[in-house]
């Protein structure tokens, strides 16, 4: 048994990093293969990770983490019942993916205005909580080509856009995203998309 | 939010020992470490050791070792620091601090008072 | 005895910037994170800066944060009456057994 690809890991910079890694041939994961991980600090414990199968010879594992911050680097242990596979380090402040934004809600009620809120993934004691800026994806259910992008640099979590900036009388879906750049991180996923119809009183044209 | 509560004043004579508690609230008790600093009158700030309350397990600095101990108690989220075969020296004001690499929250510290 | 030396004392008067500096070593602060802490008069230290440069929910810009090599510098803008107190370095000495450090600490007036 031996790896194939060697683990690759992100955090969300809050309490969870999942760390993935293909083997050289089906295998198992739960029960064949224990990741172990511990802080390189003063009286931290070793934790064992129990890998789950992310395709025949792909193995995932969510490493739970407790009060992370940059100075934090785990060391990381492959272990095949007594056999070492791969030994290596992860530093999450290095491979941050937030987490996805929240409770997408657009309110329509706004004269001619659309008012998009959402809520931000962090408590406001972790570090990502001031410093994440946000793509909005708007697109059409019935017009594919109708897909637009916002992106929203400031820390409020809102978007408004003019109701006639989009078409009236159709379906529309939006869903948000986020990244923050002091530490350089990928986008999130995105959050659930939330729906509507959108309707506004075109002027009388003459 | 995050409070540390410190036991009251404590005034001892020179060989006997003092036990200070912090009582922690507003977050994950196991899960953030807890420091152990004092302040003798008019200086500066000495760590004295840290605790894991997920664990119990414990380090102490080099100064303290063999007259400090460090404990926890789960059920009540407190955390307890015992000082013993005191001296005048070890009059100052001791504080706990939640935290790992810094520290984020202080309790509002207690005074220690040895004399004869 | 502090391995990390900070100047006694530095004074500024209202709306000017101070800075105040944190000497150490390649075992300290040249291999770790510096930490800032202010004491005001008869209260507990409180978290001013972490991880060389950043600030804690609350903290005003005002305040920030720097490192190179084997010294750190916190810098005070704007300052205010309610900023006299005592600052303190904190790093970690990596030299035997990791252990926090504290600087001597540095007392502000605000003239």
């Known amino acids: 048994m031996k790896v194939l690809q060697e683990p690759t890991c992100v955090s969300d910079y809050m309490s969870i990093s999942t760390c993935e890694w293909k083997m050289n041939g089906p295998t198992n994961c739960s029960t064949e293969l224990r990741l172990l991980y511990q802080l390189v600090f003063l009286l931290s414990e070793a934790h064992t990770c129990i890998p789950e199968n992310n395709g025949g010879a792909g193995c995932v594992c969510h490493l739970l983490m407790d009060d992370v911050v940059s100075a934090d680097n785990y060391t990381l242990d492959l272990w095949a019942g007594q056999q070492l596979l791969w030994k290596g380090s992860f530093k999450p402040s290095e491979h941050v993916k937030p987490r996805a934004p929240g409770n997408l809600t657009v309110h329509t009620n706004v004269s001619d205005t659309l008012l998009l809120t959402w809520s931000n993934p962090y408590p406001p004691d972790n570090y990502l909580y001031n410093h994440l800026t946000y793509a909005v994806n708007i697109w059409s259910e019935n017009d594919p080509a109708d897909f637009r992008i916002y992106n929203v640099t400031y820390l409020e979590p809102s978007l408004r856009i003019a109701a006639s900036t989009l078409k009236s009388g159709i379906s529309y879906r939006a869903r948000v995203r986020a990244w923050a750049q002091c530490y350089n991180t990928t986008w999130s996923e995105w959050s659930p998309s939330t729906k509507w119809h959108n309707s506004y009183r075109e002027p009388f044209e003459q | 939010q995050v409070q540390l509560v410190q036991s009251g004043a404590e005034v001892k004579k020179p060989g006997a020992s003092v036990k200070v508690s912090c009582k922690a609230s507003g977050y994950a008790f196991t899960s953030y470490y807890m420091h152990w600093a004092r302040q003798a009158p008019g200086q500066g700030l000495e760590w004295m050791g840290i605790i894991n309350p997920s664990g119990g397990s414990t380090s102490y600095a080099q100064k303290f070792q063999g007259r400090v101990t460090m404990t926890r108690d789960t059920s009540t989220s407190t955390v307890y620091m015992e000082l013993s075969s005191l001296r005048s020296e070890d009059t100052a004001v001791y504080y706990c601090a939640r935290g790992k690499w810094w520290l984020y929250d202080w309790g509002k510290g207690t005074l220690v008072t040895v004399s004869s | 005895q502090s391995v990390l030396t900070q100047p006694p004392s530095v004074s500024a008067a209202p709306g000017q910037k101070v800075t105040i500096s944190c000497s150490g070593g390649?075992?300290?602060?040249?291999?770790?994170?510096v930490s800032w802490y202010q004491q005001l008069p008869g209260t507990a230290p409180k978290l001013l800066i972490y991880d060389n440069n950043k600030r804690p929910s609350g903290i005003p810009d005002r305040f920030s944060g720097s490192k190179s090599g084997t010294s750190a510098t916190l810098a005070i803008t704007g300052l205010q009456t309610g900023d006299e107190a005592d600052y303190y370095c904190?790093?970690?000495?990596?030299?035997?057994?990791?252990?926090?450090?504290f600087g001597t600490g540095t007392k502000l007036t605000v003239l």
């Open positions: 904190g790093t970690w000495d990596t030299s035997t057994v990791l252990t926090p450090i």
């Open positions: 390649s075992s300290n602060i040249g291999n770790s994170y």
